[in-house]
Interface confidence: medium
């Protein structure tokens, strides 16, 4: 069964996925795809890494964590209802049928409040920024309110802090973190 994560329209969704590299810098290719993990590879690939770096992404999808340490959690910017669905994080461990596959369910809800029109200034959109974390039981949503000057990397930092303090153990307990080597 998939682990469920939630976000609101116009906000940023965070889908956690981790592995522990056998040695620092000894990276394993990872792909993220829209749809449940197939037998091989990822279907509808939205982002891919190789042994060195991100080598393919599609609009709005990026890794904001330290993927060189195995944090391959996916950030989806400015989500819409169409982003709802299952996402596959596939850690492509060398060897036959060694891949680790995680299916994560993203549920997008309509925005609760229509924000007052903001004066157009530039395209660092003044969306309410949000973190989605999984605690015990149903997914919890933490909204940071309308913070036009907070952007993805700051959100990522906050996400890392949340993950360190509350989320990591839950994820590891549920098998969403793997150790390689």
């Amino acid at each position: 069964s998939e682990v469920e994560y939630r976000a609101e329209v116009g906000q940023n969704a965070y889908l956690p996925c981790f592995y522990t590299p056998a040695a620092p810098g000894n990276l394993v290719p990872v792909c993220w795809g829209k749809g449940a993990c197939p037998v091989f590879e990822c279907g509808n690939v939205v982002l891919r890494t190789d042994e060195r770096d991100v080598n393919y992404w599609t609009s709005r999808y990026w890794l904001n964590g330290d993927f060189r340490k195995g944090d391959v959690s996916l950030t989806i910017e400015n989500v819409t209802l169409a982003d709802s669905g299952i996402y596959c994080c596939r850690i492509q461990i060398p060897g036959i049928m060694n891949d680790e596959k995680f299916n994560l369910k993203l549920v997008i809800k309509p925005a609760k409040v229509t924000p007052a029109p903001t004066r157009q200034r530039d395209f660092t959109a003044a969306f309410p920024r949000m973190l989605t974390t999984r605690g015990h039981g149903p997914a919890e949503t933490q909204t940071l309110g309308s913070l036009p000057d907070i952007n993805l990397t700051q959100i990522s930092t906050l996400a890392n802090e949340l993950r360190d303090s509350r989320l990591a153990n839950d994820l590891r307990d549920s098998g969403a973190t793997i150790r390689i080597g």
Epitope: T58, S59, R60, E77, D122
Partner: antibody, heavy 120, light 107 residues
């Protein structure tokens, strides 16, 4: 105000390497992605790669894989682009350009450009 | 990679004219299209993003439209400072790619 200030012009011989710097000011350095785009004389714009100054993750255009390295120094709010095994066709103006997210590679501020001339 | 084409490559116009530049993507890119203006010896300047959204500080005589594969940049009532080269750029998927440019010259 936001500024991206690049290092000065360089003249290099074929086979050499060049390292161009881009110092950011006027905003939180780790809060925006940085890209490198080049423009050969009289030609169009060519994207080379992206670096996330926060985590250091990068992605390079296939054409430059193995020859380009993008790094950053958060203590000085500076990103670097190193291009190796230079050839004459690498003669171009190299720009750093900021983008606020991967929504996506939209470049709202640019450096002034660094002319790299490769000549024997 | 997604290929971007622009037409025309060159065009001449007079101050006060209304001009249209077209950009075509080799595949559907939704509204992930931006337009830049570049003057000789200068860095490009963002004019429009998301196909039709005007960047802050850009005069309202610039407008963009289109989605999918076909896009247009329109400049109403050309001003002397508008004579430059214009590039479209897709940001739908990596790598970001630019059109070859349209140079707008004074007639």
């Amino acid at each position: 105000q936001v500024q991206l200030v690049q290092s000065g012009a360089e003249v290099k011989k074929p086979g050499a390497s060049v390292k161009v710097s881009c110092k950011a000011s006027g905003y939180t350095f780790t809060s925006y992605y940085m890209h490198w785009v080049r423009q050969a004389p009289g030609q169009g714009l060519e994207w080379m790669g992206i670096i996330n100054p926060s985590g250091g993750s990068t992605s390079y255009a296939q054409k430059f894989q193995g020859r380009v390295t993008m790094t950053r120094d958060t203590s000085t709010s500076t990103v670097y682009m190193e291009l190796s095994s230079l050839r004459s066709e690498d003669t171009a103006v190299y720009y750093c350009a900021r983008s606020p997210g991967v929504v996506t590679a939209l470049f709202d501020y640019w450096g002034q450009g660094t002319l790299v001339t490769v000549s024997s | 990679d997604i290929q971007m084409t622009q037409s025309p490559s060159f065009m001449s116009a007079s101050v006060g004219d209304r001009v249209t530049i077209t950009c075509r993507a080799s595949q559907d890119i939704g509204s992930y299209l931006a337009w830049y203006q570049q003057k000789p010896g200068k860095a490009p300047k963002l004019l429009i993003y998301a196909a039709s959204t005007l960047q802050s500080g850009v005069p309202s005589r610039f407008s963009g439209s289109g989605s999918g594969t076909d896009f247009t940049l329109t400049i109403n009532s050309l001003q002397p400072e508008d004579f430059a080269t214009y590039y479209c750029q897709q940001s739908y998927s990596s790598p970001p790619t630019f059109g070859p440019g349209t140079t707008l010259e004074i007639k």
